[in-house]
């Protein structure tokens, strides 16, 4: 057959769906690869063709759209499963073509089994709630387009294994779950199950997400440098190892880039000739406040190095701070017989 623009296997769109539930999968061509939509393509006489490769097979085969109860169907640029089966797992290809044009992309679809508590290999989206911030809501995700607005589904919310009922601060409100005041104890996996009728059958959509309670912007402060500080002096003799930790606390801030860096005599360590290494470690509190430690290390310090200015810098969306380390050369201890005796006026 003639040439076809092949976008390959789009692993960025690793689609996971639960077994025995409906799934609607849009052809990624129109969302990410082509500059026109399905309607435009259809009007121009282009045809969308679907096929697939089963798991652990190499053979591409057409999708069977003649299954009982139209279990698999296509509607515009959407491939529908009503419902999925475990062996639907594989790589799916959508191809747009006419006699003069062809473009195609493949994507992996994994049908996943869940247990009685909704645990599964599904990669879960994380929703962050601010601690003690007032009413916040999460919404049952990815259920648009499954049923018309005239259909009134029922929605049941679970935390882990348990239906959410009589919780002090968590209230199910249809597609939304309201947290009156989020606390650390609200961390966990939340599942909504949407049940709706269609053509005399009942379908269920299960959606699980992880809730993580994080520091509130109300409590956020600029970075705080705990070390270096004015109380600690790094006093070294030439030839010794100089180790200076820079320890910085960052309040949690949504989408903030936290940065820590050292300057030596106003330059980045990479831009100077001394043999310096910097090791970084990061730890997080329960509310995702962050503590970064960068340890500046000079294996064999020289008297020149001990005269330099070592400054720790930190930056977040809340501001930038800097603190110089107090570094000095250790005065050699006096040799008792000569220096001290002289000091006492001995001859």
């Amino acid at each position: 057959s003639e040439r076809c623009d092949d976008w390959g296997l789009d692993t960025m769109r690793q689609i996971q769906v639960f077994e025995d539930e409906p799934a609607r999968i849009k052809c990624p061509l129109f969302e990410h690869f082509l500059k026109f939509n399905y309607s435009t393509a259809h009007s121009a006489g282009l045809t969308l063709i679907w096929y697939w490769t089963r798991q652990d097979r190499d053979l591409e085969e057409p999708i069977n759209f003649r299954l009982p109860e139209n279990r698999i169907s296509k509607e515009k640029d959407v491939l529908w499963f009503r419902p999925t089966l475990l062996n639907d797992t594989g790589n799916y290809t959508c191809m747009l073509r006419n006699t003069t044009y062809c473009s195609k992309v493949a994507f992996p679809l994994e049908v996943v089994q869940k247990d009685s508590c909704f645990n599964s290999p599904m990669k879960l989206p994380v929703h962050k709630l601010y601690i003690e911030y007032g009413i916040q809501r999460i919404t049952c995700p990815n259920v648009d387009g499954y049923f018309p607005s005239s259909v009134k589904p029922t929605i049941t919310w679970y935390m882990g294994c348990y239906k959410i009922q009589n919780f002090n601060n968590v209230i199910p409100e249809g597609m939304n779950l309201s947290f009156l005041i989020a606390l650390i104890s609200n961390n966990g996996n939340y599942t909504c199950v949407v049940t709706y009728p269609e053509n005399g059958r009942t379908f269920h959509l299960t959606r699980t997400l992880t809730v993580k309670v994080v520091g509130s912007p109300k409590n956020a402060v600029p970075p705080v440098i705990h070390s270096p500080n004015d109380h600690v002096v790094y006093e070294k003799e030439p030839g010794e190892e100089l180790l200076i930790p820079c320890t910085v606390y960052f309040s949690f801030l949504m989408d903030s880039r936290n940065e820590v860096w050292w300057t030596i005599d106003g330059k980045k360590p990479d831009d100077i000739t001394i043999d310096v290494t910097i090791n970084e470690s990061i730890s997080h509190s329960r509310t995702e406040d962050e503590t970064r430690t960068q340890i500046l290390s000079i294996k064999k310090v020289t008297s020149e190095d001990l005269k330099r200015s070592y400054v720790c810098h930190a930056r977040s969306a809340k501001g930038e701070v800097a603190k110089a380390a107090k570094v000095k050369q250790k005065v050699p201890a006096p040799r008792y017989t000569v220096e001290l005796a002289c000091g006492f006026g001995a001859t």
Epitope: D20, L85, K114, T156, K163, T202, H204
Partner: antibody, heavy 117, light 107 residues
């Protein structure tokens, strides 16, 4: 379409056990709960317990705890309910009922178990 | 266990009548209530789940409402094929429990 086909009627002696089967088709057996409910002649419905065949999780009503065992065979999509130490008041129609969540969406046709000496 | 009390235990109404059956729980059940229909000699069938959600294929003359401890099943226009016993069932807290049933007959 969902179908639950139960085993045939049984007559049992007091003190013995009965094992009722429920063969499922038309849905993914491992993705739904299978409940067991009984109904004594002319009486109401009584929930006994349930199993999630996907992971074998079971829940039983306290009343039947220790006397009822619910199992599932994934290879044949069949659920079983075994009731031991039978007495005359266990005479009832026993139903299996499938539910993706907690409501029992579809039911078997029922199995009459008669306990008589 | 949660006790479910249904009333009336039986009723007789004419074709086309509006029929109401009530179900009361011994404690709040947060709308986790189902209604089942059982015709003589047959297995029960799910009519309504989660207080008001019509099960697939159930005629729209059936509707459910309620909250807290008190729930209602309404048949807006009784039909001959609605002759059956109706049961409520709570699924708020294990073990699931049923009401005693309401037998509906045609006058």
């Amino acid at each position: 379409q969902v179908q639950l086909v139960q085993s045939g009627a049984e007559v049992k002696k007091p003190g013995s056990s009965v094992k009722v089967s429920c063969k499922a088709s038309g849905y993914t057996f491992t993705s739904s709960w299978m409940n067991w409910v009984r109904q004594a002649p002319g009486k109401g419905l009584e929930w006994m317990g349930r199993i999630y065949p996907g992971d074998g999780q079971t829940h039983y009503a306290q009343k039947f705890q220790g006397r009822v065992t619910i199992t599932a065979d994934k290879s044949t999509s069949t659920a079983y309910m075994e009731l031991s130490s039978l007495r005359s008041e266990d005479t009832a129609v026993y139903y299996c009922g499938e539910g993706y969540l907690d409501p029992m969406d579809y039911w078997g046709q029922g199995t009459l178990v008669t306990v008589s000496s | 266990d949660i006790q479910m009390t249904q009333s009336p235990s039986s009723l007789s109404a004419s074709v086309g009548d509006r029929v109401t059956i009530t179900c009361s729980a011994s404690q709040g059940i947060n709308n986790y209530l189902n209604w089942y229909q059982q015709k003589p000699g047959k297995a029960p069938k799910l009519l309504i789940h989660y207080t008001s959600g019509l099960h697939a294929g159930v005629p729209s003359r059936f509707s459910g409402s309620g909250s807290g401890t008190d729930y209602t099943l309404t048949i807006s226009s009784l039909q001959p094929e609605d002759v059956a016993t109706y049961y409520c069932q709570q699924y708020s807290i294990l073990p699931w429990t049923f009401g005693g049933g309401t037998k509906v007959e045609i006058k």
